[in-house]
Amino acid sequence: MKVLQEPTCVSDYMSISTCEWKMNGPTNCSTELRLLYQLVFLLSEAHTCIPENNGGAGCVCHLLMDDVVSADNYTLDLWAGQQLLWKGSFKPSEHVKPRAPGNLTVHTNVSDTLLLTWSNPYPPDNYLYNHLTYAVNIWSENDPADFRIYNVTYLEPSLRIAASTLKSGISYRARVRAWAQCYNTTWSEWSPSTKWHNSYREPFEQ
């Protein structure tokens, strides 16, 4: 039994890091393999992750981590019984994929303005809380070409757009994702989308 593709990990910088790897043949990951991980820090304890299958030869493990901060570094040991298959390390702050924003809501009752709001996926005492910026994707259900991205580079989780920038009388969907420049993160997954019917008063033409 050998590792074909070494584990690569990403962290949500809150409580979970996800590691994926491939074996050289079909493997029952949960019965045959264990991923041990330990923070390089005073008093830290070793933890064991039981992997799940991710395709025939692929495995995935969700590592539970407390109080993730920039200086943290973890040792990783992949075992098959008594055999050490792979040894490595992982610094969560250098491989961050933020959590997806939640609670995306479209407020249509502001005069001819659409207000989109969503929730920051981190609590205020998490170091990512203050560093997220967002991308909002709006598209028409009727017209695949009517697809737009708004970059929200300020910290407030909201976006105002004039209803007139979208077509009236049709349905739109929106979704939002996040990233943090200061940690050079990847983009989060998209939030679940939300749907609304866009209608506004056309300006009266004389």
């Epitope: 820090f41 008093l43 304890e45 109080d67 901060v69 005492d125």
Partner: antibody, heavy 116, light 111 residues
Amino acid sequence: QVQLVQSGAEVKKPGASVKVSCKASGYAFTSYYMHWARQAPGQGLEWMGIINPSGGSTSYAQKFQGRVTMTRDTSTSTVYMELSSLRSEDTAVYYCARGKWWWQYWGKGTLVTVSS
Amino acid sequence: QSVLTQPPSVSAAPGQKVTISCSGGSSNIGNSYVSWYQQLPGTAPKLLIYDNNKRPSGIPDRFSGSKSGTSATLAITGLQTGDEADYYCGTWDTSSPPQPIFGTGTKLTVL
């Protein structure tokens, strides 16, 4: 919100012991390390040691080895720092602080006065 | 236990900029992250900067940190009277056993 509430001021005689408590609230107690540091009047900060509330393991600064004991009670989310064989130089404000490499939350401090 | 070296005091007028240095060695600042704490009179220290140059939520961008080699610097712009306090740098000494160490402290006076 995160709060670390420390016990009140103490006056002790040389040779005695003191036990300072730090009650945590507003977060998962066993998920965060707790440090103890002290500050003598008009002086700087001095690290004393650290406890992992999850398993109760500890590490102490060499200067305090043999005189300091840190414990925790998970049922009350409280950590304790006991310092024995007190001398006048131990007169200081004692702080608990939550964190690993740096400390974002601090208790308000407990003044321990050692005087005959 | 080694201690990081800071100037005992610095002063500047309101609105001005001030910098506070923190000098260490290869076994501490040179090999670890630096944090900065503000201690107002009669209160507990408060985290201002972590990870050399990052600010926790609620800390204004008037405060900034930097690190180069074995020394670090805290800069405060647009000084306010409320900034008058003691400032401490902190890091980890990685010699055995590893442990946190602090600077000697700097008293900031706003003239």
